[in-house]
Amino acid sequence: RRRRRDTHFPICIFCCGCCHRSKCGMCCKT
C-alpha cells in the first residue's frame, strides 16, 4: 500500500506511446 505522503507524487513507469510520445520510455504521471 502506498504511504500517505506519497499520494501526490508522480509515479513513474515504463510504457509505450505514453507522455505524449510515440516511442517507449519512462513516463511519470501524478
Epitope: 502506498r2 507524487f9 508522480p10 513513474c12 507522455c19 510520445r21 516511442k23 517507449c24 520510455g25 519512462m26
Partner: antibody, heavy 121, light 107 residues
C-alpha cells in the same frame, strides 16, 4: 552549481554490507528521480537501481534485487544505497546519477564522481 | 534477454566525421541516449531522446535511431572528443541497458 558527491565506498569482505551515500546540491533534490549506476574496472556501465519521487516507486536490476536497497532523504538532499550480501562481482565504481527533469525522464543528465567498492577476502 | 551492441573501437582523423553505432532488438521503438566518458572521468550526457543535445554540448554531436540501430555522429571530430561512448535505452521499468562502449580514437 549542480553537484552529486558519493561517499561510503571501500574494501569489504564477501557476504558483508556497505552503505553508499550521494549528497546532492545546486538543485531541488525532491523534484528528480535518482539512479545508481556502476562500472567494474575496465568495463562498461551497468544500471543498478532507481528511486523516483515517491519512496515507494523504486526499481532494481535483477543482479542486485533482494540484496540492495535504494532510498532517499529529501530533507537531507541525500540518496543512499544499502548493499548487503556483497559478492566479488559487485566490485565497481558506483555512480549516483540524476534522472532528467520532466514527465519523460529517460536519460541521466548529471553524474557524481563515483565511489569505489571492492569486495575481496 | 536484451542487449545493446557497440563496436569496441572507432578511429577517425581530426576534422573528419566519426560514426558510432548501437544495435539492439527493436531499439528504434525506444528512446536512445548517448554518454561520453573521458579517461578517469564520470560519464556526460551528450544525446537524449535519440536526437536532442543537452545545453553545453557542441552542435557537432548528433544522433539518430530507427529500426534496430541508434547512431551517434560527431562531425568535425576534435582531439578533445577522444573518449569512450556508451549508448543507453530502457527496455522495462527494471531493465535499463547500456551498450558495451566504443573507444573513439582521434588519430
Amino acid at each position: 552549481q549542480v553537484q552529486l558527491v558519493e561517499s561510503g565506498g571501500g574494501v569489504v569482505q564477501p557476504g558483508r554490507s556497505l552503505r553508499l551515500s550521494c549528497a546532492a546540491s545546486g538543485f531541488t533534490f525532491s523534484s528528480y528521480g535518482m539512479h545508481w549506476v556502476r562500472q567494474a574496472p575496465g568495463k562498461g556501465l551497468e544500471w543498478v537501481a532507481v528511486i523516483w519521487y515517491a519512496e515507494s516507486n523504486k526499481y532494481y536490476a535483477d543482479s542486485v534485487k533482494g540484496r540492495f536497497t535504494i532510498s532517499r532523504d529529501n530533507s537531507k538532499n541525500t540518496l543512499y544505497l544499502q548493499m548487503n550480501s556483497l559478492r566479488a562481482e559487485d566490485t565497481a565504481v558506483y555512480y549516483c546519477a540524476r534522472a532528467q527533469e520532466g514527465i519523460a525522464p529517460d536519460a541521466f543528465d548529471i553524474w557524481g564522481q563515483g565511489t569505489m567498492v571492492t569486495v575481496s577476502s | 534477454c536484451y542487449e545493446l551492441t557497440q563496436p569496441p573501437s572507432v578511429s577517425v582523423s581530426p576534422g573528419q566525421t566519426a560514426t558510432i553505432t548501437c544495435s539492439g532488438d527493436k531499439l528504434g521503438e525506444r528512446y536512445a541516449s548517448w554518454y561520453q566518458q573521458r579517461p578517469g572521468q564520470s560519464p556526460v550526457l551528450v544525446i537524449y531522446q535519440d536526437i536532442k543535445r543537452p545545453s553545453g554540448i557542441p552542435e557537432r554531436f548528433s544522433g539518430s535511431n530507427s529500426g534496430n540501430t541508434a547512431t551517434l555522429t560527431i562531425s568535425g571530430t576534435q582531439a578533445m572528443d577522444e573518449a569512450d561512448y556508451f549508448c543507453q535505452a530502457w527496455y522495462s521499468s527494471t531493465n535499463v541497458l547500456f551498450g558495451g562502449g566504443t573507444k573513439l580514437t582521434v588519430l
